[in-house]
């Protein structure tokens, strides 16, 4: 199950948006989603991996169909490895992880 | 500069419950999580459970029964609370920040708890 | 539970030697392992953290390697203020769990 995960950090460098969508993948019914994330010391490594431990992200549905999820405040030069989980009764499934550093993408002001 | 300071009874009889605060400062309660460990005397550290910034618990399952973790994020306090013990849970117990999700950084010195009738 | 083997116990160098010691994680824990010196009476503090990066302040004859399942901390040049105990830690998953500790003497 490959969910795209994009992030942006704003010009003041103050939080880092991630928003994604599952409007590719089909027969989600009675599955639920959510944001898991591991912050690292330090930067991505090269081969991002799924952490044991992590924590969820409250995500939140737009408007256009994707979820949005606000990091506020932001450790810019600390990885940020990030998936979405799909729990079902029979199961859970984790999409392959991204690892995303805030300082690399800050959208200029 | 990151700060923590453990404050406990120093005594607990057995089968009462251990309470312990510690006060945080030079970081944030919601950014980073906070772990507790104990160190029985002259042995080695061991991990009883965490509570991280976005709020969630997770504990050592040979305490989980009867350990809680919560905190007062206006105060800057994070709590451990453990029930029932025994002259076993003599130890020096101490909180740690974590770095991210990641290694525990900084330690407080600790809070002595003997347990003892 | 992840266990984390760590040898020797005890170790008496003398000043200006080099010493080595080592944990061995029972399963793959990548890089996740953090070095503490833990000195008498004092908390621990931690030395080096994801397996071989110095912790702010830390001198450099303190070196960390490894990964996967072995790990080695060296202490280059033994200074007096070296007598301490060191702790190896994983934190790949839960539960975090310490190597037993190696107590470090001076003769």
């Known amino acids: 199950v490959n969910i795209n995960i994009s992030c942006e950090t704003d010009g003041y460098l103050t939080k880092m948006t991630c928003r994604w969508s599952t409007s590719t993948i089909q027969s989600l019914a009675e599955s639920t989603l959510q944001l898991r994330y591991h912050r690292s010391s330090l930067y991505c490594s090269d081969i991002p991996s799924i952490h044991p431990i992590s924590e969820p992200k409250d995500c939140y549905l737009q408007s256009d169909g994707f979820y949005e999820c606000i990091f506020q405040p932001i450790f810019l030069l600390s990885g940020y490895t990030m998936w979405i989980r799909i729990n079902h009764s029979l199961g859970s499934l984790d999409s392959p992880p991204t690892c995303v550093l805030p300082d690399s993408v800050v959208k200029p002001l | 500069q990151v700060k923590l300071l453990e404050s406990g009874p120093g005594l607990v009889a057995p089968s009462e419950s251990l309470s312990i605060t510690c006060t945080i400062s030079?970081?944030?309660?919601?950014?980073?999580?906070v772990s507790w460990i104990r160190q029985p005397p002259g042995k080695g550290l061991e991990w009883l459970g965490v509570?991280?910034?976005?709020?969630?618990?997770y504990f050592n399952s040979l305490f989980k029964s009867r350990l809680s973790i919560t905190r007062d994020n206006s105060k800057s306090q994070v709590f451990l609370e453990m029930d029932s013990l025994q002259t076993d849970d003599t130890a020096m117990y101490y909180c740690?920040?974590?770095?991210?999700?990641?290694?525990?950084?900084?330690w407080g010195q600790g809070t002595s708890v003997t347990v003892s009738s | 539970e992840l266990v984390m083997t760590q040898s020797p116990k005890f170790m008496s160098t003398s000043i200006g030697d080099r010493v080595n010691i080592t944990c061995k994680a029972t399963?793959?824990?990548?890089?996740?392992v953090t070095w503490y010196q833990q000195k008498p009476g004092q908390s621990p503090q931690a030395l080096i953290f994801?397996?071989?990066n110095r912790h702010t302040g830390v001198p450099a004859r303190f070196t960390g390697s490894g990964s996967g399942t072995d790990f080695t901390l060296t202490i280059n040049n033994v200074k007096s203020e070296d007598l301490a105990d060191y702790f190896c830690?994983?934190?790949?998953?839960?539960?975090?769990?310490f190597g037993s500790g190696t107590k470090l003497e001076i003769k």
């Open positions: 994801l397996a071989s």
């Open positions: 740690a920040k974590h770095d991210g999700h990641e290694t525990m950084d900084y």
């Open positions: 509570i991280w910034g976005g709020g969630s618990t």
């Open positions: 030079g970081f944030s309660l919601t950014d980073d999580g």
């Open positions: 399963q793959n824990v990548r890089t996740a």
């Open positions: 830690l994983q934190h790949w998953n839960y539960p975090l769990t």
